[in-house]
């Protein structure tokens, strides 16, 4: 268990032409708040799919009123971190969605109005317990700068928050090979039984039965030194058998384009098509410097002393990508059948099967629902040999692939106003009512049970929505 923490540094116009209009005006002052949605893995999921790792909502920022004629500045931000607690192991790879919402504070009938200003998304690799990672994302003409980290909650420790701390058995020191559990100096790491034969000098484990190699070593038991002297070229993907680096066949081998850029060969070399927010020959320039710590998984950052010069991450064995964020992908052969999720554990590949399938490669069909995929968080319901999809709020149709208006069923009681939200819906309640769907009459203490708005309550206070 642990907590993912997100710190928003700034939200404002991005560089370049076409600066956005200020979202607030003298007639309609407004304030911002942010929502973060986390999902495990690196899958390209729809924004509407559940935030399986969790979600969090910020407080609202200070009220902002545009100065007439002035360009939109960085907008005032809410105080504090956004915290997303996770109960189980930290997955290491995750997808995020960060939304910037605007609350208009004019005299709307029925309370404040909200609108989505910007949504950014990305996929990252992150070890728990590491330093803050900084990031810049652009959405249209807006730019969002933020930092994030994952930390374990005691007694969990380790990069996945799976190792546990235990009280010391001896008062003076921990047992052989066991370290004190910082910051709980009076406790020791509980011993782990690694994979049988795993090199005690060059291997380690964070889960029982695992054998992960220190830099410079490879092989299932971390007993094979990585050698580059007999290799032909320092370019190309790592060979799992020899530990050598083998040459690639063309200029786009290994995709020289950083930050998700796509590579196309040209008569003389290659050309990168960069995603929004990145530029340069290899899409390597993003305004982030080595001082921001952009290299993951122990990667070494070189260059990039100022935002206009590129940084390069030199990755340790087993990782690749412009920020060393990608593990060398042995799952690309798609060994898992029936939509199973492939997990590269270092020493082995494992398939995590979808509901209704089993077996080492998810090859066994278990039940009626097995061949039936319900999209967008829908669940398959069996019954008498037949099956159907019970769709999540906001979706409909036979396989839950059709967008439905979650507000169409008028879920907000007592005149509450409904707003669609990417993970459900929110109700802004009429004065005198409360609850997720405005189903409760407000009862002031020491008064009758007639609905009444308590002093200072703004109906549908969006600071609460999570």
């Amino acid at each position: 268990a642990g907590v993912f923490e997100l710190q928003i540094h700034s939200f404002g116009p991005g560089p370049g032409p076409g600066a956005p209009r200020s979202p607030c005006s003298a007639r309609l002052p407004c304030r911002l708040f942010f929502r973060v949605c986390l999902k495990p893995g690196l899958s390209e999921e729809a924004a509407e799919s559940p935030c399986a790792l969790g979600a969090a909502l910020s407080a609202r920022g200070p009220v902002y009123t545009e100065q007439p004629g002035a360009p939109a500045p960085d907008l005032p931000l809410p105080d504090g971190l956004l915290q997303v607690p996770f109960r189980d192991a930290w997955p290491g790879t995750f997808s995020f969605i960060i939304e910037t919402w605007r609350e208009e504070l004019g005299d709307q009938i029925g309370g404040p109005a909200w609108s989505l200003l910007a949504r950014v998304a990305g996929r990252r690799r992150l070890a728990a317990g590491g330093p803050w990672a900084r990031d810049i994302q652009r959405a249209g003409a807006w730019e969002l700068r933020f930092s994030y980290r994952a930390r374990c909650e005691p007694p969990a420790v380790g990069t996945a928050c799976t190792r546990l701390c235990r009280p010391r058995s001896a008062p003076s020191r921990c047992g052989p090979g066991l370290r004190p559990c910082a910051p709980l100096e009076d406790e020791c790491e509980a011993p782990l039984v690694c994979r049988a034969g795993c090199s005690p000098e060059h291997g380690f484990c964070e889960q029982p039965g695992e054998c992960r190699c220190l830099e410079g070593w490879t092989g299932p038991l971390c007993t094979v030194p990585v050698s580059t002297s007999s290799c032909l070229s320092p370019r190309g993907p790592s060979s799992a058998t020899t530990g050598c680096l083998v040459p690639g066949p063309g200029p786009c081998d290994g995709n020289p384009c950083a930050n998700g850029g796509s590579c196309s060969e040209t008569p003389r070399s290659f050309e990168c098509t960069c995603p929004r927010g990145f530029y340069g020959l290899r899409c390597e320039v993003s305004g982030v410097t080595c001082a921001d710590g952009p290299c993951f998984n122990g990667g070494l950052c070189v260059g990039g002393a100022d935002p206009d010069s590129a940084y390069i991450c030199h990755c340790p064995p087993g990782f690749q990508g412009s920020n060393c964020e990608k593990r060398v992908d042995r799952c690309s052969l798609q060994p898992c059948r029936n939509g199973g999720l492939c997990l590269d554990l270092g020493h082995a590949l494992r398939c995590r099967c979808r509901a209704g399938f089993a077996g080492p490669r998810c090859e066994h069909d278990l039940d009626d629902c097995a061949g039936r995929a319900c999209a967008n968080g829908g669940t398959c319901v069996e019954g008498g040999g037949a099956h159907r999809c019970s769709c999540a709020l906001g979706f409909g149709g036979r396989d839950c692939r059709e967008r439905a208006d979650p507000c169409a069923a008028r879920p907000c009681a007592h005149g509450g106003r409904c707003y669609a939200h990417f993970s459900g819906l929110v109700c802004a309640c009429a004065p005198g009512y409360m609850g997720a769907r405005c189903e409760f009459p407000v009862h002031p203490d020491g008064a009758s049970a007639l609905p009444a708005a308590p002093p200072g309550l703004r109906p549908g206070d969006p600071q609460r929505y999570l």
Epitope: L57, Q83, P85, A392, S423, G435, A436, E439, L457, R464
Partner: antibody
């Protein structure tokens, strides 16, 4: 770790009042409603009321109106439930439980519960 | 208020068998129905919300179905740890109400 931690067991005399606390940690306190549910020995679950930690507004089950008061302290992320004019049939385990504010998600129902506080009313 | 009636009151089954628990509402609860599991001396634990969506960390042997007034909780293959009391709860309208519970015991 997301949790709700409740105060310890209480023994009260008929006619007295009891105040049970529920401290939230691991989530944004003002982003979830807190409900109170009680369970008499060997019986089922009975909903008592709801409080919104953000604005402090609350709503009570009709059965408890006039006897129950729910309050919150945002500085300590704690919600309180006070029940007055106690009688023997109020002997029960009192639970707090959280509910999210976006309809259609897990938090739509009571996804996290406190460990319960046993209140015994006896002369 | 919406009255929820669970049946049967007690269900005696063996591990490995399939369990089907019913919850009937006196008026429509739409799909705002949850199922909880409670073991002696413990707080209830959320299994199903929205009538058919599994809560985080709940094994896929648990499934819920129904809408309106008739709801079902199905446990496809009973494990020893599944023997407990199960409650349905409607959160469609105030006041929220619970069923009286179904005790699932080992045969």
């Amino acid at each position: 770790q997301v949790q709700l931690v409740q105060s310890g067991a209480e023994v009260k005399k008929p006619g007295a009042s009891v105040k049970v606390s529920c401290k939230a940690s691991g989530h944004i306190f003002i982003s979830y409603y807190i409900h109170w549910v009680r369970q008499a020995p060997g019986q089922g679950l009975e909903w008592m009321g709801i409080i919104d930690p953000s604005g402090g507004s609350k709503s009570y089950a009709q059965k408890f109106q006039g006897r129950v008061t729910m309050t919150r302290d945002t500085s300590t992320s704690t919600v309180y439930m006070e029940l007055s004019s106690l009688r023997s049939e109020d002997t029960a385990v009192y639970y707090c439980a959280r509910q999210g504010m976006i309809v259609g998600t897990t938090g739509d129902a009571f996804d996290i519960w406190g460990q319960g506080t046993m209140v015994t009313v006896s002369s | 208020e919406i009255v929820l009636t669970q049946s049967p009151g007690t269900l005696s089954l063996s591990p490995g068998e399939r369990a089907t628990l019913s919850c009937r509402a006196s008026q429509s609860a739409s799909s705002y129905l949850a199922w909880y599991q409670q073991k002696p001396g413990q707080a209830p634990r959320l299994l199903i919300y929205g009538a058919s969506s599994r809560a985080t960390g709940i094994p896929d042997r648990f499934s819920g179905s129904g809408s309106g007034t008739d709801f079902t909780l199905t446990i496809s293959r009973l494990e020893p740890e599944d023997f407990a009391v199960y409650y349905c709860q409607q959160y469609n309208s105030s006041p929220y109400t619970f069923g009286q519970g179904t005790k699932l015991e080992i045969k």
